[in-house]
């Protein structure tokens, strides 16, 4: 929802967290603001305190329940409001009717590990965290490998167009240090976006055997 120079953007992690960012030019830094969530079909409501992340933007996480509990469904709509204190009352600064499964951003994949490493290839696996039962197998992944002397931005993206929680990296250089990251995205949702990148996994390929062609 955008009001003039105000922007209010939220994402649902598909289980029990809605993360919101509110930005407004010229907003007072010392004003106390919060996000309030009212689902249309549920018995709970939730509030979180907006904390500054830059000069004109604030963020907070609505914790809806235990991390792996499914708190919203594909038919739910949540009214999200930014409320800021003005003297003794609260003023509504922004409002949106939020469809959780149209605005998904999952948690970064976790538990990255090297399953098998050779001189030229490496098999890596990972797990998804706090992902809804609704997705079944309807997820995709992007992966990238950091080579020596390059930046993450330069790393080519490898796309896995299915729920495949492993990858076999080929054509690697022997006895070389690499780093690997992966991110996940559900196929569902008009405004769904990629998860953050996972924590990097460092690994080293095996040295080439002496006397062998590399």
């Amino acid at each position: 929802a955008v009001n003039g120079t105000s922007q209010f953007t939220c994402f649902y992690n598909s289980r029990a967290n809605i993360s919101c960012v509110w930005s407004q030019d010229g907003a007072l830094q010392d004003t106390s603001c919060q996000v309030h969530a009212w689902p249309d079909r549920r018995r709970w409501n939730q509030t979180c305190e907006l904390l500054p992340v830059s000069q004109a933007s604030w963020a907070c996480n609505l914790i809806l329940g235990a991390p792996d509990s499914q708190k919203l469904t594909t038919v739910d709509i949540v009214t999200l409001r930014v409320l800021c204190r003005e003297g003794v009352r609260w003023r509504v600064m922004a409002i949106q009717d939020f469809k959780p499964f149209e605005n998904l951003r999952l948690m970064a994949p976790i538990s990255l590990q090297v399953v098998h490493v050779e001189t030229h290839r490496c098999n890596i696996s990972w797990e998804i965290s706090q992902a809804s039962h609704y997705f079944e197998r309807h997820l995709e992944f992007e992966a990238r490998t950091l080579s020596p002397g390059h930046t993450w931005e330069e790393a080519p993206l490898l796309t896995l167009k299915q729920k495949q929680e492993w990858i076999c990296l080929e054509t690697l250089t022997p006895d070389t240090q690499y780093e690997f990251q992966v991110r996940v995205k559900p196929l569902q949702g008009e405004f769904t976006t990629w998860s953050p990148w996972s924590q990097p996994l460092a690994f080293r390929t095996k040295p080439a055997a002496l006397g062998k062609d590399t």
Epitope: D40, R41, R43, S69, T73, V75
Partner: antibody, heavy 116, light 107 residues
Framework: QVQLVQSGAEVKKPGASVKVSCKAS????????ITWVRQAPGQRLEWMGD????????NYNEKFQGRVTITVDTSASTAYMELSSLRSEDTAVYYC?????????WGQGTLVTVSS | DIQMTQSPSSLSASVGDRVTITCRAS??????LNWYQQKPEGTLKLLIY???GLHSGVPSRFSGSGSGTDFTLTISSLQPEDVATYYC?????????FGQGTKLEIK
């Protein structure tokens, strides 16, 4: 206290339409979904559709193939369910209910009999 | 559509007995499972919401448990006024669907 009061029993001929009303009181009508459920004799409960009075948004069970229309009159805090092209198998008790993490309050039910 | 299957279809128990009714969903519905009581005259009441939440005014002898596809309604000590038909219902997705019901009688 929350109350949902439905209109009285109806007898209709095949091919006709029926419109059942559900008057809500004891809560803010525009803030909760109203759902319609029916129960044919000796059968399980069957969800027909729902409406959010605050916006007029509706959802329908595809089984009813466009025969059902759910509306509200917010000024009267009343929801309506209209079922058209009636057939004998539509003979059932029709219930309205409020949705709030389950259907937490129900109307008393309206018996609709379809008979030639 | 998600199919809901209850068992048993009917049961007879004595006052004071512990009674268990089960409900199985044809696919994972997380915890979006509710239980209703329908008295012989047709009156419907919500007993349990979101698998285990006790609706206001419902006696504490009623409880619910389960997750995913398998769910249970338990009456810890059966009372004469519990004679009714009990229905499970999923609100995981539209169209919402109900079990076929379990008719409970007193011996």
């Amino acid at each position: 206290q929350v109350q949902l009061v439905q209109s009285g029993a109806e007898v209709k001929k095949p091919g006709a339409s029926v419109k059942v009303s559900c008057k809500a009181s004891g809560y803010t009508f525009t803030s909760h979904w109203i759902t319609w459920v029916r129960q044919a004799p000796g059968q399980r409960l069957e969800w027909m559709g729902d409406i959010y009075p605050g916006s007029g948004n509706t959802n329908y069970n595809e089984k009813f193939q466009g025969r059902v229309t759910i509306t509200v009159d917010t000024s009267a805090s009343t929801a309506y369910m209209e079922l058209s092209s009636l057939r004998s198998e539509d003979t059932a008790v029709y219930y309205c209910a409020r949705e709030r993490g389950g259907f937490d309050y129900w109307g008393q039910g309206t018996l609709v009999t379809v008979s030639s | 559509d998600i199919q809901m299957t209850q068992s048993p279809s009917s049961l007879s128990a004595s006052v004071g007995d512990r009674v268990t009714i089960t409900c199985r969903a044809s696919q994972d519905i997380s915890n979006f499972l509710n239980w209703y009581q329908q008295k012989p005259e047709g009156t419907l009441k919500l007993l349990i919401y979101y698998t285990s939440g006790l609706h206001s005014g419902v006696p504490s002898r009623f409880s619910g448990s389960g997750s995913g596809t398998d769910f249970t309604l338990t009456i810890s000590s059966l009372q004469p006024e519990d004679v009714a038909t009990y229905y499970c219902q999923q609100d995981n997705n539209h169209p919402y669907t109900f079990g076929q019901g379990t008719k409970l009688e007193i011996k």
